[in-house]
């Protein structure tokens, strides 16, 4: 009678994570009289993956009635598969005895487990930047198996060049993790702007991850400030308003200043939004021009999300100013504007 | 359900034998060993030995080698462990045990007094 | 035959303590065939890890297994009264299968 043979059919098996991995063994005679056990790995570390009469293996059930005297069939199904049951399994005769000895073994069978990446995560700079500047976009995505993957980064649809990814580790390991890091040149219109990191794996089916940055949590678009006169409102008054164009974040402190004394704070609140994201913002000052003797220098100081301040002055000659109700009032707007 | 039930308590005298038995119910009675665990009063746990009830084969401990007999009957799915020639050594709660360690009888006292 | 042994054989713990149960073989044994049990007064063992490091159906994330050769641990990362008990080592990589002596493990 020919020597039993241990066949192992599939030399590989592939299989999704979660998913169960049926792993063939047959043998070809029922002679000598001993057990099949399965092993992870060869060599003295092997790992125990099966035993027919002795532990506890959860996750493993025989397809067959493996402990049938004349079962010849010792396949196996492993569930709920993850990256750390990728490897090479044995099935390895022992002939019975005191203690039982390895008789032969399989050629093995490689299992590789598909695993999906985890939802790319991506985070941009910790402070913000202004428009003209360089940030840098980090992107994120683990846990997936086999290691080839692709990684592209887009601004509001169209596709970044300016980036450099690694993928973890180098050699083989049972998952692997990407990291992307790309640039990003800010503008002012960005406050709608998205920066998308999109991942590509065999295990998608084509339906690649997203992960996005929103760049209003990137940006700040410093204010642009103009003074001007309105017309006198009553008698000896003059309306002095500070325009605050185009900025954002919202978070601004505006403070008016007369001949260099504090005169009013005021927190920016009922802004108007821009189409592009920004916002417009507006306050007054009413100067009474018959307190003054001599000429006032007006100073609307802005403090924009924590940023050193700028200024935009505009002088008020009383001087010119008469005295009779109705006349126009002198003024002369200097256009500085001072940080 | 996986069950192994024991049967009850013994007291019996030095140098008399003892039969434990120990009835399977819920799996494959020949699927997996059956082992024999000892453990005497606040102390650790000795491992007797096991049968394979496929086809009796039988393994002991060389501590327990003349004092314990392991035996089965498939036909009631019941596993036997006769303890021989007994001492008051022999005082102690003996389990049965599946093969996959997770299934313990819920012991038999034993008590070897004249 | 491989003597398991473990230490301390008793210890008590406060609650949200971390605890350290250990196991050392006289020779190597491979980690697939390294359990642990958990005993109360009165009741049978109750599996309690295997393969070193797999907890058992029940058994609290708290607790957690790992090593290798001939030195094994047991370990709660937040001791629970509930966890008073003793636990034993066990190995069945030769025979005769063998147990630890047991760490009896109080709350204060």
């Known amino acids: 009678e020919e020597e039993l043979q241990v066949i192992q059919p599939d030399k590989s098996v592939s299989v999704a994570a979660g998913e169960s991995a049926i792993l063939h063994c047959t043998v070809t005679s029922l002679i000598p009289v001993g057990p099949i056990q399965w092993f992870r790995g060869a060599g003295p570390a092997r790992e125990l993956i099966y035993n027919q009469k002795e532990g506890h293996f959860p996750r493993v059930t025989t397809v067959s009635e493996s402990t049938k005297r004349e079962n010849m069939d010792f396949s196996i199904s492993i569930s709920n598969i993850t990256p750390a049951d990728a490897g090479t399994y044995y099935c390895v005769k022992f002939r019975k005895g005191s203690p039982d000895t390895e008789f032969k073994s399989g050629a093995g069978t490689e299992l590789s487990v598909r695993a999906k990446p985890s939802a790319p995560v991506v985070s941009g700079p910790a402070a913000r930047a202004t428009p003209q500047h360089t940030v840098s976009f980090t992107c994120e995505s683990h846990g997936f198996s086999p290691r080839d993957i692709t990684l592209k980064w887009f601004k509001n649809g169209n596709e970044l060049s300016d980036f450099q990814t690694n993928v973890d580790p180098v050699g083989e390991s049972v998952s692997y993790s990407i990291h992307s890091t790309a640039k990003v040149v800010l503008t002012r219109e960005d406050v709608h702007s998205q920066v998308i990191c999109e991942v590509a794996h065999v295990t998608l089916q084509g339906d690649p991850l997203r992960g996005t940055a929103n760049l209003s949590e990137t940006i700040r678009v410093p204010p642009t400030l103009e003074v001007t006169q309105q017309p006198v409102r009553a008698e000896n008054q003059v309306n002095v308003t500070c325009q605050v164009r185009k900025f954002y974040p919202q978070r601004l402190q505006l403070t008016w200043l007369e001949n260099g004394n504090v005169s009013r704070t005021e927190t920016a609140s009922t802004v108007t939004e821009n189409k592009d994201g920004t916002y417009n913002w507006m306050s007054w000052l009413l100067v009474n021009v018959s307190a003054h003797r001599d000429d006032v220098k007006l100073t609307c100081q802005v403090e924009h999300d924590g940023q050193p301040a700028v200024s935009k002055s505009h002088d008020l000659k009383v001087s010119a100013h008469p005295k009779e109700q109705g006349s126009n009032t002198a003024a002369e707007n200097t256009g500085s504007n001072e940080r | 359900e996986v069950q192994l039930q024991q049967s009850g308590a013994e007291l019996v005298k030095p140098g008399a034998s003892v039969k434990l038995s120990c009835t399977a119910s819920?799996?494959?009675?020949?699927?997996?060993?059956m082992h024999w665990v000892k453990q005497r009063p606040d102390q650790g746990l000795e491992w007797i030995g096991r049968i394979d009830p496929a086809d009796g084969d039988t393994k002991y401990n060389p501590k327990f080698q003349d004092k314990a007999t392991i035996t089965v009957d498939t036909s009631s799915n019941t596993a036997y462990l006769q303890l021989s020639s007994l001492t008051s050594e022999d005082t102690a709660v003996y389990y049965c045990v599946r093969g996959n360690y997770v299934n313990w009888g819920q012991g038999t006292t034993l008590t070897v007094s004249s | 035959q491989i003597v398991l042994i473990q230490s301390p054989a008793i210890m008590s713990a406060s609650p949200g303590e971390r605890v350290t149960l250990t196991c050392r073989a006289s020779?190597?044994?491979?980690?697939?065939?390294l359990y642990w049990y958990q005993q109360k007064p009165g009741s049978s063992p109750k599996l309690w890890i295997y393969s070193t490091s797999n907890l058992a159906s029940g058994v609290p994330a708290r607790f957690s297994g790992s090593g290798s050769g001939t030195s094994y641990s047991l370990t709660i990362s937040s001791m629970e009264a509930e966890d008073a008990a003793s636990y034993f080592c066990?190995?069945?990589?030769?025979?005769?299968?063998?147990f630890g002596g047991g760490t009896k493990l109080e709350i204060k």
């Open positions: 020779s190597s044994v491979s980690s697939s065939y």
């Open positions: 819920g799996f494959n009675f020949e699927d997996t060993y």
């Open positions: 066990h190995q069945w990589y030769s025979y005769p299968r063998t």
